[in-house]
């Protein structure tokens, strides 16, 4: 209703003597803010004088008169909406009712908080969850229904009193909804801790004992079992019998089946607590174990290892790793089944005994071809010695031997000639399959390593062959030592260095890159013509008339061999030049006259200069000069020059005439 | 230093002729390491030589294929000019004419004349 | 009649760039070539004769290269005043003929 004061708070607040309350309070009043607060305790109305009566604890008025009480508590509140109290210390005759007598300008509220004040520390309050089972982990919750600013108070959990390794966390709520000091562990019980006390315990800021709570752990757990056997060592003999006994040490809730269990696999129509063996056989010895149930599920207990001891079985050889590469290690195992275990063995090589060898295992770490063979062994322990089984077959593998590549022509080899090689070994295991030659070529190969070189090359200097089983042995290479006429012939100009030009000495070379046998002709030619037999053509001073093609050749006693055609170019200045005209050197004015300057020149001629009879020179730089209209002043002697980038050249004079045209004579 | 100046109409009537003068200054006509050019300039043919004329030991003249029907360039030693006379002209022959020297030293046109814009117009 | 072909017909640059511009002959012209420069509404201007020779006056940054066809005309850092035509020619046989221009314009 509005025209209520409201106020939040705790309704109880708890604590007890000599300790301290807060109370954390907001209130909104109706109307302005607050004028005067008086706190009661126990207040009571009395209707003669519109007034509470009680005990004032605390009060605010205008003119701020404050009694002595008001020490111990206190007012932390405000004019509009704080009404936070404190009571410190806190006394057993201050349980009851506080009353908050509230006055603003025009409204008055009283508003009532219960305190309850025991005489002694009241004690906390364990929380548990409804089912505990083992190793599942839980929450633990001590709650105590105080929290004061002034009175620091502890919670500590303790294990059949000793405090618990467990970290605990603490919190405090202070607030307008609640006021508790709460204590959570997290804690995986064991089923040992199955009907312990677990102590809550209250404690001041010096941890003095103040109160506490203690429950029983209630743990719920799979049957624990012990298992006993009679011999205690579990180890018998073929025949011997075996008893094994199983006791339930704890379990929550009670038990309700049995059963024994061996290498894992439960044993059938065996539901009691003990198991009898009578004349065990080997193939009894094996890891046993009894499994009770109960609600929880189903517990087991340690392993029994049972062991049947008898004399080994016939042995058999294991061979790492057969077959054997020649050069690598190998290792036998002697395998024999015995309890005991093996003490000693007799190792045989194709049924011979091999000396010094009575190890389990035999190791070679270098094998050879003549460790091939049978290996068997006889296994002993103290029940008697084994028989001597099968044995193993030890292949030993390697690449063939000596190999040999041989040349099966009559020598020497000429280029061209066909060859035919054979490849040779001594011995292979695995047998030979193949062949390889070196270099690669495409070669026949008619039957098995042998190898035919059609029209053999000349540079085909040396073959290997290799004989192949899982690997290849590769023969030393064989010189085929082929003869063949001179190769690579080519003319090359040893001077001058640069470009020829015309007047220059010149030589040229006759170059081979080889040839077999080494002793060589030389013969140089030009158009068919025989010009010298010696590896060099010199020329003292080169005409531009030497130009031409120009071929050398080489020959020994398997034949001859000539150069491409070389062309010797000689670059020499223009000459030969002469000025030719058309139509002639005769023409009538007015029609057009065309000078040609002719040259023989190498490079071509690049521009040409023209000039008059009196060496003027005229703006052209053409082949051709055109005068058109030509005019009878035109009429005299001309010459030009030819440049190229080796030099100049100049023609000799050539006469123009210009006639007069018969209408200019019949102007006359 | 040399100088070419160029004088003459710049409208001209069709089937007319055209005449243009270029006067010298710095050099002479008559010069034997010269050669006197006329060039146009016209958007449809860009810059093209019509023609020269120039001195050795006689006058000697060149003329561009195009033109040469109806071209006639004259030295005038006594004005030290020389002239260009275009005959029969078209609209065609509208464009920028420039007189220029060609030294034989360097084969190019080193001096221009500051250009004449003719218009051939009916 | 001699050819001459010249290649960019325009370019877009900017100062400070380098300019190459080609010229080709439709035969051997030896050496006879030479580039000029017009501005608009001006006579052109002789920049460089004989391929490669640097006309007096002209600044260093223009440069020219070539014989035979194929010619070239280099301006290594464009300046502001070198936005114009230019245009190449060949003096080695009558007719005289020019190359159709190329123009060079900011960017």
């Known amino acids: 209703d509005s025209s209520k004061w409201v106020f939040e708070h705790p309704e109880t607040l708890y604590a007890w003597e000599g300790a301290c309350v807060w109370i954390p309070c907001t209130y909104r009043a109706l109307d302005g803010d607050l004028e005067s607060f008086i706190l009661f305790h126990n207040p009571e109305y009395n209707k003669n004088t519109s007034k509470f009566d009680g005990t004032r604890l605390y009060e605010s008025t205008k003119d701020g008169k404050v009694p002595s009480e008001q020490k111990r508590v206190q007012f932390l509140g405000d004019k509009n909406k704080n009404c936070t109290l404190s009571i410190h210390p806190v006394h057993l005759n201050d349980s009851g009712q506080l009353g908050l007598r509230m006055e603003s300008k025009t409204e008055k509220w009283m508003e009532r908080i219960h305190l309850n004040v025991s005489e002694r520390p009241f004690p906390p309050h364990i929380q548990l969850p409804p089912e505990i089972q083992e190793s599942q982990e839980v929450t633990l919750t001590c709650l105590l229904n105080f929290s004061c600013y002034g009175y620091p108070i502890q919670l500590q959990w303790l294990l059949e009193g000793v405090p618990m390794r467990q970290a605990a966390v603490t919190s405090t709520s202070l607030t307008i909804k609640s006021v508790f000091t709460r204590s959570e562990l997290k804690f995986s019980p064991q089923w040992s801790h199955h009907g312990k006390i677990v102590t809550c315990q209250l404690q001041d800021a010096d941890g003095k004992f103040l109160s506490n709570d203690t429950v029983q752990l209630n743990v719920k757990h799979t049957p624990k079992l012990e298992i006993k056997v009679t011999p205690s060592d579990a180890i018998v003999r073929e025949g011997d019998s075996v008893t094994m006994t199983c006791e339930v040490s704890s379990s929550n809730p009670e038990y309700t089946t049995v059963s024994w269990l061996k290498d894992g696999t439960s044993l059938k129509k065996q539901n009691t607590f003990t198991l009898n063996l009578r004349e065990v056989t080997k193939d009894q010895s094996g890891k046993y174990c009894c499994q009770v149930s109960n609600d929880v599920g189903p517990g087991r207990s340690e392993e029994v290892f049972l062991q049947v001891q008898y004399a080994p079985e016939p042995s058999t050889v294991q061979i790492l790793h057969s077959p054997a590469v020649e050069g690598s290690q190998v290792e036998f195992l002697c395998m024999s089944l015995a309890n005991p275990l093996p003490t000693n063995y007799t190792w045989y090589h194709n049924g011979k005994e091999m000396q010094g060898r009575t190890e389990e295992k035999v190791h070679i770490p270098k094998i050879l071809p003549w460790h091939a063979g049978t290996y068997s062994c006889v296994a002993e322990n103290i029940l008697g010695t084994g028989q001597r089984g099968p044995g193993a077959e030890l292949d030993v593998q390697y690449p063939p031997k000596k190999v040999t590549t041989v040349i099966q022509n009559p020598m020497p080899i000429r280029e061209g000639d066909t060859v035919t090689l054979s490849c040779n070994y001594n011995s292979s295991n695995p047998s030979v399959t193949r062949y390889e030659w070196k270099p690669h070529g495409a070669w026949e190969e008619p039957s098995l390593g042998v190898l035919k070189i059609q029209n053999v090359g000349w540079d085909n200097t040396t073959i290997a062959c290799a004989a192949c089983n899982s690997w290849c042995s590769w023969a030393s290479p064989v010189a085929l030592n082929v003869q063949y006429a001179p190769r690579d012939v080519r003319v090359r100009k040893i001077k001058p260095l640069s470009e020829i030009h015309s007047g220059n000495s010149v030589s040229l070379q006759c170059d081979f890159s080889s040839s077999h046998p080494k002793e060589v002709q030389f013969f140089w030619e030009k158009n068919g013509r025989l010009l010298g037999k010696e590896s060099q053509l010199n020329f003292d001073s080169i005409s531009p008339e030497d130009a031409g093609s120009y071929s050398c050749w080489v020959n020994n006693s398997i034949g001859q061999t000539a150069s491409k055609a070389w062309t010797l170019e000689v670059l020499y200045a223009p000459r030969r030049l002469r000025v030719s005209m058309s139509p002639g050197d005769q023409v009538m004015e007015g029609k057009s006259a065309t000078l040609t300057c002719e040259s023989d020149a190498n490079p071509p001629v690049s521009h040409y200069t023209w000039f008059d009879w009196n060496n003027q020179s005229l703006p052209y730089h053409s082949q051709k000069l055109r005068l058109e209209p030509v005019k009878v002043q035109h009429s005299g002697a001309y010459w030009c020059q030819g440049t190229n980038s080796v030099g100049k050249g100049r023609s000799p004079l050539s006469t123009l005439t210009v006639y007069y045209s018969p209408e200019t004579i019949g102007r006359r | 230093q040399v100088q070419l100046q160029q004088s003459g109409p710049g409208l001209v009537k069709p089937s007319q002729t055209l005449s243009l003068t270029c006067a010298i200054s710095g050099d002479s006509v008559s010069s034997n390491s010269a050669a006197w050019n006329w060039i146009r300039q016209s958007p449809s043919r860009g810059l093209e030589w019509l023609g020269r004329t120039y001195y050795r030991s006689t006058w000697y003249n060149d003329y561009a294929v195009s033109v040469k029907s109806r071209i006639t360039i004259n030295p005038d030693t006594s004005k030290n000019q020389f002239s260009l006379q275009l005959n029969s002209v078209t609209p065609e022959d509208t464009a920028v004419y420039y007189c220029?020297?060609?030294?034989?030293?360097?084969?190019?046109?080193?001096?221009w004349g500051q250009g004449t814009m003719v218009t051939v117009s009916g | 009649d001699i050819q001459m072909t010249q290649s960019p017909s325009s370019l877009s640059a900017s100062v400070g760039d380098r300019v190459t511009i080609t010229c080709r002959a439709s035969q051997s012209i030896s050496s006879y070539l030479n580039w000029y420069q017009q501005k608009p509404g001006k006579a052109p201007k002789l920049l460089i004769y004989?391929?490669?020779s640097l006309q007096s006056g002209v600044p260093s940054r223009f440069s020219g290269s070539g014989s035979g066809t194929d010619f070239t005309l280099t301006i290594s850092s464009l300046q502001p005043e070198d936005f114009a035509t230019y245009y190449c020619q060949q003096s080695y046989s009558t007719p005289l003929t020019f190359g159709g221009g190329t123009k060079l314009e900011i960017k």
């Open positions: 220029a020297r060609e030294v034989s030293g360097t084969s190019a046109f080193d001096i």
């Open positions: 004989a391929a490669s």
